[in-house]
């Protein structure tokens, strides 16, 4: 969480950004609110990048002037042009790439006066991991995928039966690069896994957590998986 | 030469299904949104679904549940599997890859849907 | 839902004049993901206008692009025999939603 004051005369406006992560080949929302302005016409919204001269993104007199815009944004950004007067100046940016990553500046400027604030715009790729009992394997395994990460994460595993085992001996974990040549499928397999338990496949990076969990018995397999961001907010 | 070339489409009766190939070659379909856009018989374009580069899909309300846009990362090919298919299907599908916008454009393939 | 509206439905002109094509959208659209087409009789639509203004590779600079929020417009500035063909507009929305005008034929006078 960042907050940034800017001075206007006697003036200054507040503006929190948020550090965020963008999924690459995926929309993204770079967040940023400040006080809000019933008065759109006198709203500035600026948007740049470190390093990239011209603007990411403009939004002024209740509109788009993207006259300024560098040609790596062109056709990709937009504000929420209707949550502008309630103090939204989020940037969503189409289609993520890992060049995206960077320090981003929110600058606005109201009736009210001006501020600004940065944030750290994190880019990667990560997915929600699959659990699934492998009966192929001459001993009971269990094997967990997902299809889209990076940078390259660490994979563990964990047992609510064997709380704080160490599964590295028994379980295999590969990287796959996928076609695009940068993201990778993460696949793990856990042998001698035992039934009646309940077991933790966790990828993990510096960009986001997921764990995805499954609980074999005899008469069912029960599957959880959720995932989240790391230093965002 | 960046190209998109689409194949699989043909007669087919009401309530059946079809699969529609777009191979691209010049690019990377797994890099980019690649859409179905159709166009039916004398009207204007219709979006029909999208495929993220993560591998995320969307469709149409008037498509969704009947058909499920794929792609083949190793071939380098999109999908469109069409199911219960109707009269009003009947139309040309192109596919599309969308950068900045729909840049790259196939030939279409038609599907006509009679008994 | 954002519905994009096109007007004139059908445009006669003659070659060397000038053309004026208006999009409008139900709902305020970002400017970055506004787009204009061209499609001829029997051929692939092909993207001409990305961004509201910006014009796509190898297109002809009589042809340009403006306008924000609400209300988009293409304007080709003098008119070709080439340029005889149906126009759409299309936008990016937030459902994800890819929508597309209903188009405007631009025909020989």
């Known amino acids: 969480l960042i907050i940034g004051f800017g001075i206007s005369g006697k003036h200054f406006i507040t503006v929190t950004t948020f550090t965020s992560a963008g999924n690459i080949g995926e929309d993204g929302t770079l967040s940023c609110t400040f006080e809000p302005d019933i008065k759109l016409n006198g709203i500035v919204i600026q948007w740049l990048k470190e390093g990239i001269k011209g603007l990411v993104h403009e939004f002024k007199e209740g509109k788009d002037d993207l006259s300024q815009q560098h040609e790596m944004f062109r056709g990709r950004t937009a504000v929420f042009a209707d949550q502008v007067v309630v103090g939204n100046a989020s940037l969503r940016l189409k289609n993520v790439q890992l060049t995206d990553a960077g320090t981003y500046t929110c600058y606005i400027r109201t009736s009210k006066g001006k501020g600004n604030a940065n944030l750290e715009y994190k880019t990667g790729a990560f997915s929600m991991p699959e659990i699934n009992v492998d009966y192929n394997a001459s001993s009971e395994s269990l094997r967990c995928e997902a299809p889209r990460w990076f940078p390259q994460p660490t994979v563990a595993w964990a047992s609510q039966v064997d709380q704080g085992a160490n599964f590295s001996e028994v379980s295999n974990t590969s990287f796959e690069l996928n076609s695009e040549n940068v993201t990778m499928k993460v696949v793990s397999v856990l042998y001698n896994v035992t039934i009646n338990n309940t077991y933790s496949c966790m990828i993990e990076n510096d960009i986001a957590k997921a764990t995805g969990d499954i609980k074999v018995t005899d008469s069912e397999v029960k599957r959880r998986s959720q995932l989240q961001l790391l230093n965002s907010g | 030469e960046v190209q998109l070339v689409e194949s699989g489409g043909g007669l087919i009766q009401p309530g059946g299904s079809l699969r529609l190939s777009c191979a691209a070659s010049g690019f990377t379909v797994s890099s980019n949104y690649m859409n179905w856009v159709r166009q039916a018989p004398g009207k204007g374009l219709e979006w029909v679904s999208v495929?993220?580069?993560?591998?995320?899909?969307y469709y149409a309300d008037s498509v969704k549940g009947r058909v499920t846009i794929s792609r083949d990362n190793s071939k380098n090919t999109l999908y469109l599997q069409m199911n219960s298919l109707r009269a009003e299907d009947t139309a040309v599908y192109y596919c599309?890859?969308?950068?900045?916008?729909?840049?790259?454009w196939g030939q279409g393939t038609t599907v006509t849907v009679s008994s | 839902e954002i519905v994009l509206t096109q007007s004139p439905g059908t445009l006669s002109l003659s070659p060397g004049e000038r053309a004026t094509l208006s999009c409008r959208a139900s709902?305020?659209?970002?400017?970055?993901?506004l787009a204009w087409y061209q499609q001829k009789p029997g051929q692939a639509p092909r993207l001409l206008i990305y961004?509201?203004?910006s014009r796509a590779t190898g297109i002809p600079d009589r042809f340009s692009g403006s306008g924000s929020g609400t209300d988009f417009t293409l304007t080709i500035s003098r008119l070709e025999p080439e340029d005889f063909a149906v126009y759409y507009c299309q936008q990016y929305g937030s459902s994800p939603m890819y929508t597309f005008g209903q188009g405007t034929k631009l025909e020989i006078k």
């Open positions: 495929i993220y580069g993560s591998g995320r899909t």
């Open positions: 961004g509201a203004s």
């Open positions: 709902q305020s659209v970002s400017s970055s993901y």
């Open positions: 599309a890859r969308d950068t900045y916008a729909m840049d790259v």
